[in-house]
């Protein structure tokens, strides 16, 4: 579909005569009839197959025809067609004299014709005007013409229909050749497919309008490339949705159990050394001068009972001082001015002379001690219970009440799954609250480091479901990078999402 446009520019009839040579009275009031038809080698009369058009009287004798298109007038003349433009045409332009106001062919005398021109040729669709001039013995006509496509028609023959749109069915404008040109943010054959936010994950994200990234279930983040861990997962991550893989130092199904209390809470005070001993369990090894479960108590220098023979100890800033009872002297009241004659031994102790009677020594009965057998034995004084165990006096004996995770007479033994050295080939054993874990040296693997592995851990193709295998050069083990939809250390398990979970 298109329009053949004819622009009449100038008509010259200086003598004001008709084609017959007879002059017009009073002058030649001139109008034009145009016939457009298919190509003929010799243009002959007959139907105007492409269309006809007539003008009103445009002038008398010689005149210029002004461009009247802007004012809604009839120049250029429009000859619309509703078919594919064939690229060739024939054109007949007749100039007529109108004696009266009726311009119909039947109302005119046959000799009212002033001039007739006929041309034919090829004409391509385009915006450029072709200028032509036709001269006869008495008249001259200057004109130009072109063929353009109707609105929404494109291509060399105006045969390609394209109507720009921006709705659910497409988002495009039309190129000069009639092909679609998508509006920014749209793609696809009919520009119906939005271009998502740059970087939006192909599988895990989608969009309904340009520059958007909406996440499919189980994924989150601006680009939908972060999986959502299992609801309730505390100190864990995921590689596929709804997993919960514990961070270092955490255990339990939801990674909410502290396996590294020392690092996470630093419970030991005053520079003490902390050792993890299971879930929420630890042991502090105190520096000299400190005691208590968390080494929070400062030991007094008098706690070691340095004063002998019943001397009383007084703490001082720079140490301690012994106040000796009568008959004793020295830094620790260790020297006596008494002899066995003074009956210095208490609680049934036996006195023995020393240095020819200048000194003595007491031999104490059970449960008493001291230079003069003056002290009842407190078997807990020496803090014999290790690892924070509580010492209990039981008459002549004592016993240790151990903290969880320890055993033995003095709580010196750590109850440990690692005690039986389960890790082979020099593997390092780690106690966990709910089991043990072996860290294997290079060249070994397996739950207990019992499997000798080759240097290229991927040589045996251990990964399933087209997963990519990587060799960890530091441990000679392999890591499987699973494709979407598979999990497991070897990517052997397809992911299944239970319908009973709301997420």
């Amino acid at each position: 579909s298109g329009v053949f446009q004819l622009q009449l520019q100038e008509f010259i009839n200086e003598r004001g005569v008709l084609a017959s040579g007879r002059p017009c009275e009073p002058g030649c009031r001139t109008f034009f009839r145009v016939c457009l038809k298919h190509f003929q080698a010799v243009v002959s009369p007959g139907p105007c197959t492409f269309g006809t058009v007539s003008t009103p009287v445009l002038g008398t004798n010689s005149f210029a025809v002004r461009d009247d298109s802007s004012g809604g007038g009839r120049n250029p003349l429009q000859l619309p067609f509703n078919f594919t433009w064939p690229g060739t045409f024939s054109l007949i332009i007749e100039a007529w004299h109108a004696p009266g106001d009726d311009l119909r062919p039947e109302a005119l005398p046959p000799d009212a014709l002033i001039s007739k021109i006929a041309i034919q040729g090829s004409l391509a669709v385009g915006q450029n005007w072709l200028l032509d001039e036709q001269t006869s013995t008495l008249t001259r006509l200057r004109y130009s013409y072109r063929v353009i496509c109707s609105d929404n028609y494109y291509g060399d023959n105006c045969s390609r229909l394209c109507k720009k749109r921006n709705d659910h069915f497409g988002h495009y404008v039309c190129q000069p050749d009639g092909n679609l040109s998508c509006l920014p943010g749209w793609t696809g054959e009919y520009c119906q497919q939005p271009i998502c936010l740059s970087g939006c994950h192909e599988q895990n994200g989608y969009c309904s309008k340009p520059a958007e990234c909406l996440c499919r279930p189980g994924w989150q983040g601006r680009l939908c490339n972060e999986c959502i861990p299992h609801n309730g997962c505390r100190h864990g991550t995921c590689s596929t949705p709804w997993q919960c893989t514990c961070d270092e130092g955490w255990g339990g199904l939801f990674c909410d159990q502290d396996l590294n209390y020392c690092t996470h809470h630093s419970p030991c005070k005053n520079g003490a050394t902390c050792s993890n001993s299971g879930q929420r369990s630890y042991t502090c090894t105190c520096r000299p001068g400190y005691t208590g479960v968390d080494c929070e108590l400062e030991l007094s220098e008098c706690d070691s009972n340095p004063c002998r023979n019943g001397g009383s100890c007084k703490d001082q800033e720079d140490g301690y001082h012994c106040l000796c009872p009568p008959g004793y002297y020295g830094l620790h009241c260790e020297h006596s001015t008494l002899s066995c004659a003074d009956s210095p031994c208490f609680n049934g102790g036996s006195c023995r002379e020393r240095n020819q009677g200048a000194n003595y020594a007491c031999e104490c009965p059970p449960n008493f001690t001291g230079s003069n057998c003056e002290k009842k034995v407190d078997r807990c004084t020496s803090n014999p219970c290790a690892n924070g165990g509580q010492c209990l006096n039981r008459g002549p004996s004592r016993m240790c009440r151990c903290r969880p995770g320890f055993t033995g007479t003095y709580c010196e033994l750590h109850v440990s799954d690692c005690a039986r050295n389960p890790c082979a080939h020099g593997g390092t054993c780690h106690d966990l609250e709910n089991g043990l874990m072996c860290t294997c040296p290079a060249g070994f693997s397996g739950r207990r480091c019992e499997v000798r592995t080759s240097i290229d851990a991927c040589a045996s193709s251990p990964c399933f479901n087209r997963a990519t295998c990587y060799t960890d050069l530091s441990t000679d083990t392999f890591v499987c990078n699973c494709p979407y939809g598979f999990v497991g250390s070897r990517c052997e398990f397809p992911v299944g999402l239970p319908p009973s979970f709301p997420w």
Epitope: T245, C246, G251, G252, D417, N434, G435, L436, V487
Partner: nanobody, 120 residues
Framework: EVQLVESGGGLVQPGGSLRLSCAAS????????IGWFRQAPGKEPEGIGC????????YYADSVKGRFTISRDNAKNTVYLQMNSLKPEDTAVYYC?????????????WGQGTQVTVSS
């Protein structure tokens, strides 16, 4: 394909007992730790306890300690949750799960769940 199927749920009176079973398939059963968690309507899931791959190590949440016991029969590829002295607050859907490793550290697979209702 890893599959965990729970059974044994139902309605029980306060103070009563119930034993849940979890039948496993699709993996080497004695390589993986197995645990139980539960979820009451409108609440976050709560880990109940777990048993290591060998069965030598178990742990329990404080809320069920002394009342619930987890055991496993590697010959039958089954884990059990024995629940005694049940309380109304134990009402939930109970799921068995595995981290996919020998120690109880996380969740990678879980079953469809079985409903336990404690009510008089």
């Amino acid at each position: 394909e890893v599959q965990l199927v729970e059974s044994g749920g139902g309605l029980v009176q306060p103070g009563g007992s119930l034993r849940l079973s979890c039948a496993a398939s699709g993996f080497t059963f004695d390589d993986y730790a197995i645990g139980w968690f539960r979820q009451a309507p409108g609440k976050e899931p709560e880990g109940i306890g777990c048993i290591s791959s060998s069965g030598g190590s178990t742990y329990y949440a404080d809320s069920v300690k002394g009342r619930f016991t987890i055991s496993r029969d590697n010959a039958k590829n089954t884990v059990y949750l024995q629940m005694n002295s049940l309380k109304p607050e134990d009402t939930a859907v109970y799921y068995c799960a595995t981290p996919g490793i020998a120690a109880c550290r996380g969740i990678h697979y879980w079953g469809q769940g079985t409903q336990v209702t404690v009510s008089s």
